[in-house]
Interface confidence: medium
């Protein structure tokens, strides 16, 4: 049988059964999530569930820029350091940068400090680039 690789929306990239869209507009975390949803197909801010997935994403984004942090779909909605992925994925893989998780920082970003391979928490109202993901 011929297995066709699913196609992603124009401007999105494909990796391991998922489509990713990197958006270089400044949005706070909730507006970024709303914009991801607005593309349909069940899109949300991206969950990153393995080092392999993180490496692929990091390589792609590094082709555009290397200095701006990027929102992902990890957040702490209860503000109790109980982090969860907005798309409902299991929170098993972790890649925190080791920075303090305190303060009013309840949304996660890919940090540019380590080529987007590690995460930092940040204030959710900060406006920055974001990464969306859906399964075609």
């Amino acid at each position: 049988d011929i297995i066709m690789r699913p196609s992603c929306a124009p401007g999105w990239f494909y990796h391991k059964s998922n489509c990713y869209g990197y958006f270089r507009k400044l949005r706070n975390w909730s507006d970024a999530e709303l914009e991801c949803q607005s593309y349909g197909n069940g899109a949300h801010l991206a969950s990153i569930l393995s080092l392999k997935e993180a490496s692929t994403i990091a390589e792609y984004i590094s082709g555009y820029q290397r200095s701006q942090p990027i929102w992902i779909g990890l957040h702490d909605p209860q503000k109790r350091q109980q982090w969860q992925w907005i798309d409902g994925a299991m929170y098993l893989y972790r890649s925190w940068s080791g920075k303090s998780m305190g303060g009013n920082k309840h949304c996660a970003e890919m940090s540019s400090n380590n080529n987007f391979l590690t995460w930092s928490s940040n204030e959710c109202n900060k406006r920055q680039h974001f990464l969306c993901k859906y399964r075609p």
């Epitope: 929306a9 124009p10 401007g11 958006f23 270089r24 507009k25 400044l26 949803q37 607005s38 593309y39 349909g40 197909n41």
Partner: antibody, heavy 127, light 105 residues
Framework: EVQLLESGGGLVQPGGSLRLSCAAS????????MSWVRQAPGKGLEWVSA????????YYADSVKGRFTISRDNSKNTLYLQMNSLRAEDTAVYYC?????????FGSGSYLNPFDWGQGTMVTVSS | YELTQPPSVSVSPGQTASITCTGD??????VSWYQQKTGRSPVLVIY???RRPSEIPERFSGSNSGNTATLTVSGAQSMDEADYYC?????????FGGGTKVTVL
Amino acid sequence: EVQLLESGGGLVQPGGSLRLSCAASGFTFSSYAMSWVRQAPGKGLEWVSAISGSGGSTYYADSVKGRFTISRDNSKNTLYLQMNSLRAEDTAVYYCARDRVRRVPFGSGSYLNPFDWGQGTMVTVSS
Amino acid sequence: YELTQPPSVSVSPGQTASITCTGDKLAEKYVSWYQQKTGRSPVLVIYQDDRRPSEIPERFSGSNSGNTATLTVSGAQSMDEADYYCQVWDSNTVIFGGGTKVTVL
């Protein structure tokens, strides 16, 4: 192949009414926001109105608010523009256009990007 | 919200044409560009500032920073002669620039 076919244009007197239709095919009509954009003779593009895929959200340019009504019938794959109290400055070619991507929901955090366009229908308002 | 474009741009065949579109804090918005040839419907050539639909030639590119977005046509051809419009979505309305007539001399 996406196809958009406008109809209903013609000559109408100032103060009159007209209903434009846009028959869509080649895509899942209910999944896409749709717009009407017009172009007066020798002038630039002017957005008129837009509607979400479900029909639940509508948007209008200030120049037509209160006079024009956008609607859609997803069972018939058809977009409409009801134009009342027409003025000479409404004279233009009217295009219907499909948004570039499926958007569910449409609203905050979203934005319109007319992509596929019909061939247009001419509306002339004159006495 | 207003988008301002130059009324006309001239370019020699094979040269590069740059069409600007200015607006307040434009870099915060997604800019699209449309090409409209005489008597034809508009065609989307750039969306989300710099992304090109698959059917659009690579000589078309876009950028957006500060208050200015730019559509660049590299190696302009006679078939690129057309009106070009920038467009954004602002406050639940679609905004078009006034259009730029590109002439390939």
